[in-house]
C-alpha cells in the first residue's frame, strides 16, 4: 500500500515560520502577509516505527522537492540536515531511521523527536532568522514546540 502523506506547514510556539535559506537549510523567522507564501510546505508521511497514542513516526519531506529532513552525526554531534533522495523511491513506508521523527503531541503542541537520536528534537532559536537545528534540550531557551497547519493538496 502507498504511504499515507499530508501537506502541512509548521510554526514554532513563538509563531515563527520555516523558510528555505539556501538549497539545504531551513531558517525560522516571523512572517506576515504575503511573505507567508515563503514558508515551506512539508509532505508529512506516516511511516513504519514504534507507535503509541501520542507518538507517531513520520518523515518530513519538502513538498514537490526530493529533500527530506534527516538526522546524522557530524563532528560527533547529532545534526539536522536536508538530504536529497531519489524521487522514484521516496516516500516509502519503511524509511531509513535517519529520516524518521517521532511526532509527539502534548497539550495541542507537537514535538518532533529524532528516532535515530532519542532525546534530540527539531528545534528553533529564540533569535530571529537562525537555522533550524537538532537540539538536545527541552523547556529552556530553545524552542521544541510546534503547531501544524494543514495545506490542501
Amino acid at each position: 500500500a502507498p504511504v499515507r502523506s499530508l501537506n502541512c506547514t509548521l510554526r514554532d510556539s513563538q509563531q515563527k515560520s520555516l523558510v528555505m535559506s539556501g538549497p539545504y537549510e531551513l531558517k525560522a523567522l516571523h512572517l506576515q502577509g504575503q511573505d507567508m507564501e515563503q514558508q515551506v510546505v512539508f509532505s508529512m508521511s506516516f511511516v513504519q516505527g514504534e507507535e503509541s497514542n501520542d507518538k507517531i513516526p513520520v518523515a518530513l519531506g519538502l513538498k514537490e522537492k526530493n529533500l527530506y529532513l534527516s538526522c546524522v552525526l557530524k563532528d560527533d554531534k547529532p545534526t539536522l540536515q536536508l538530504e536529497s533522495v531519489d524521487p522514484k523511491n521516496y516516500p516509502k513506508k519503511k524509511m531509513e531511521k535517519r529520516f524518521v521523527f517521532n511526532k509527539i503531541e502534548i497539550n495541542n503542541k507537537l514535538e518532533f523527536e529524532s528516532a535515530q537520536f532519542p532525546n534530540w528534537y527539531i528545534s528553533t532559536s529564540q533569535a530571529e532568522n537562525m537555522p533550524v537545528f537538532l537540539g538536545g534540550t527541552k523547556g529552556g531557551q530553545d524552542i521544541t514546540d510546534f503547531t501544524m497547519q494543514f495545506v490542501s493538496s
Epitope: K77, N119, W120, M130, G136, T137, G139
Partner: antibody, heavy 118, light 108 residues
C-alpha cells in the same frame, strides 16, 4: 534567581586529577547546555567542553584528547568536570556557564581556581 | 574550527567618547556571535547575543552589529565602569565553540 555555584579552589600535583562541580538553581537544569570554559592567568577564554543534562550528551575541545570527563546529576542539578593527567599548563580558573544551542552563555559560575604545582 | 580575531588588542578611549571593538570570523557565521565583558577577578558577563540583541539589564550604550564575518561592538559613550576586557565568541559551528583573544579597553 538563576545561580551557578562552583566548588572551591584546588591545588593538585602534576599527573593528578581534579573534579569541579557546578550546582544550578533557579532554572530548568535540563533545558540548557552546560559549558566549561577555562582561563589561564592573564590569558583569554578557552572552551573546554559541554554537557547536555537532558540527554547526557557530552563533547569537548579536541585539545584535551580524552583528559576531560563531564558528568551531571539531574537529581541535584549539578554538573561536574573532571580533568586528568594534570600539568602545570592546566593551572587556570575553570568556569561553568549555561547556554542555548548557539552558545549564548548568559549565566556563569563564580569560577574555580585549579593550581597544578609540584 | 572557526577562528575569531579581535582588534585592536588594546583600545584607549576618553570618558564620554565612542569605543568601537572589532571581531572577524574566519568563515561565515551569520549572526551567531556573542560579546562578553570581563572585569578583573570576575566571571565574564554576556552583553550582546546574536550580533545585535542586548542581554537583559545591559545598558543601552552597548550595541552590536554585523553579520557574516565582520562584527562590531560599540560603546556609545564610555563610562569608567566599562573598563574591562571584551571577548567575542561564535556558536555557529561547534564543536568547538571559539572565543576571540580579547580586546582590553582602557581609559585615555
Amino acid at each position: 534567581e538563576v545561580q551557578l555555584v562552583q566548588s572551591g579552589a584546588e591545588v593538585k600535583k602534576p599527573g593528578a586529577s581534579v573534579k569541579v562541580s557546578c550546582k544550578a538553581s533557579g532554572f530548568s537544569f535540563t533545558g540548557y547546555y552546560m559549558h566549561w570554559v577555562r582561563q589561564a592567568p592573564g590569558q583569554g577564554l578557552e572552551w573546554v567542553g559541554l554537557i547536555i543534562p537532558h540527554n547526557d550528551y557530552t563533547v569537548n575541545n579536541q585539545k584535551f584528547k580524552g583528559r576531560v570527563t563531564m558528568t551531571r546529576d539531574t537529581s541535584t542539578s549539578t554538573a561536574y568536570m573532571e580533568l586528568s593527567s594534570l600539568r602545570s599548563e592546566d593551572t587556570a580558573v575553570y568556569y561553568c556557564a549555561r547556554s542555548d544551542y548557539y552558545g549564548a552563555m548568559d549565566y556563569w559560575g563564580q569560577g574555580t581556581l585549579v593550581t597544578v604545582s609540584s | 574550527e572557526i577562528v575569531m580575531t579581535q582588534s585592536p588588542a588594546t583600545l584607549s578611549v576618553s570618558p564620554g567618547e565612542r569605543a568601537t571593538l572589532s571581531c572577524r570570523a574566519s568563515q561565515n557565521i551569520g549572526t551567531s556571535i556573542h560579546w562578553y565583558q570581563q572585569k578583573p577577578g570576575q566571571a565574564p558577563r554576556l552583553l550582546i547575543k546574536y550580533a545585535s540583541d542586548s542581554d537583559y539589564g545591559i545598558p543601552a550604550r552597548f550595541s552590536g552589529s554585523g553579520s557574516g564575518t565582520e562584527f562590531t561592538l560599540t560603546i556609545s559613550s564610555l563610562q569608567s565602569e566599562d573598563i574591562a576586557v571584551y571577548y567575542c565568541q561564535q556558536g555557529a559551528s561547534w564543536p568547538p565553540f571559539t572565543f576571540g583573544q580579547g580586546t582590553k579597553l582602557e581609559i585615555k
